[in-house]
Interface confidence: low
């Protein structure tokens, strides 16, 4: 399973996401960026399995997001880990 997910940096339009996972265990990571308290569709993103950090740009200022990450192999997906974050005001 995934270890932990941490929002390392927060800006008004972007954030940096870090996570831990066993080396070589996953082909890619599936990340959902969901604006909290809205019915807007989540942005579904994938990240190469070698990465443990990624920037998430294109966000709205002063907005509450729920970010969920899963590790994926060809036939398996981990239990999701989630983190909530409020982007900075402009």
């Amino acid at each position: 399973n995934l270890g932990e997910v941490v929002v390392a940096e927060v800006g008004w339009d972007a954030l940096k996401l870090n996570w831990t996972a066993p080396e070589g265990a996953y082909e890619y990571f599936f990340i959902q960026v969901q604006e909290a308290d809205t019915v807007e569709a989540a942005q579904n993103l994938t990240v190469p399995g070698g990465l443990r950090s990624t920037d998430l740009p294109g966000l709205k200022a002063a907005t509450h997001y729920t970010i969920t990450i899963r590790g994926v192999t060809q036939d398996f997906s981990t239990t999701p880990l989630s983190v909530e974050v409020l982007t900075e005001e402009v």
Epitope: E23, G24, E27, Y28, F29, I31, Q43, N44, L45, T46, V47, P48, G49, G50, L51, R52, T54, P57, G58
Partner: antibody, heavy 121, light 107 residues
Framework: QVQLVQSGAEVKKPGSSVKVSCKAS????????ISWVRQAPGQGLEWMGG????????NYAQKFQGRVTITADKSTSTAYMELSSLRSEDTAVYYC??????????????WGQGTTVTVSS | DIQMTQSPSSLSASVGDRVTITCRAS??????LGWYQQKPGKAPKRLIY???SLQSGVPSRFSGSGSGTEFTLTISSLQPEDFATYYC?????????FGQGTKVEIK
């Protein structure tokens, strides 16, 4: 099956600009980053920059900052790379490559066929 | 930028030989490294991702190992179709950087 199809060869004069296109099919275009990599004759591979269509944000290698512009049109699943102020050393094959996932850089798993750009007076 | 030093720059080998190519990163990149094969006039083809994971459809004679700063691509028994140029690519830190390539030629 994912396919990246690039525009045809170009011959350009020094000081001019070139715009190369890369049309993706067979996958979800917006969620995957497209990078551009070039290869000068007889030389190695060099990452130029990339774009995440879902956000429209591009990122560039320092070497090309200010000279390259990478854009994407989600409606046509096409990415573009424009290089300005061309010089003879920009003569190269330019490849687009789709990352396995969301990042500006990474493990390039699908490649276009390459577009030869020749800069000559 | 991270420098990727690949060695040797070229090698001559015979069909059936075991071939090893090394890539050294100027700083630690965990296992964020891929290996690519390129034939003349063609786009590169990924063989290995995450240092040691075999790309789907790639023959099992190709293998990768290493972590941190030292990485190796091994071809256990060289086949005629393996004569090509091989590149490593680090994707641990931006910008992505390639090794300078290793040309594998017929002895």
């Amino acid at each position: 099956q994912v396919q990246l199809v690039q525009s045809g060869a170009e011959v350009k004069k020094p000081g001019s600009s070139v715009k190369v296109s890369c049309k993706a099919s067979g996958g979800t275009f917006s969620s995957y980053a497209i990078s551009w990599v070039r290869q000068a004759p007889g030389q190695g591979l060099e990452w130029m920059g990339g774009i995440i269509p879902i956000f429209g944000t591009a990122n560039y290698a320092q070497k090309f900052q200010g000279r390259v512009t990478i854009t994407a049109d989600k409606s046509t699943s096409t990415a573009y790379m424009e290089l300005s102020s061309l010089r003879s050393e920009d003569t190269a094959v330019y490849y687009c490559a789709r990352l396995y996932g969301y990042a500006y850089y990474g493990a390039f798993d699908y490649w276009g066929q390459g577009t030869t750009v020749t800069v000559s007076s | 930028d991270i420098q990727m030093t690949q060695s040797p720059s070229s090698l001559s080998a015979s069909v059936g030989d075991r071939v090893t190519i090394t890539c050294r990163a100027s700083q630690g990149i965990r296992n964020d490294l891929g290996w690519y094969q390129q034939k003349p006039g063609k786009a590169p083809k990924r063989l290995i991702y995450a240092a040691s994971s075999l790309q789907s459809g790639v023959p099992s004679r190709f293998s990768g190992s290493g972590s941190g700063t030292e990485f190796t691509l091994t071809i256990s028994s060289l086949q005629p179709e393996d004569f090509a140029t091989y590149y490593c690519l680090q994707n641990g830190l931006q910008p992505a950087t390639f090794g300078q390539g290793t040309k594998v030629e017929i002895k």
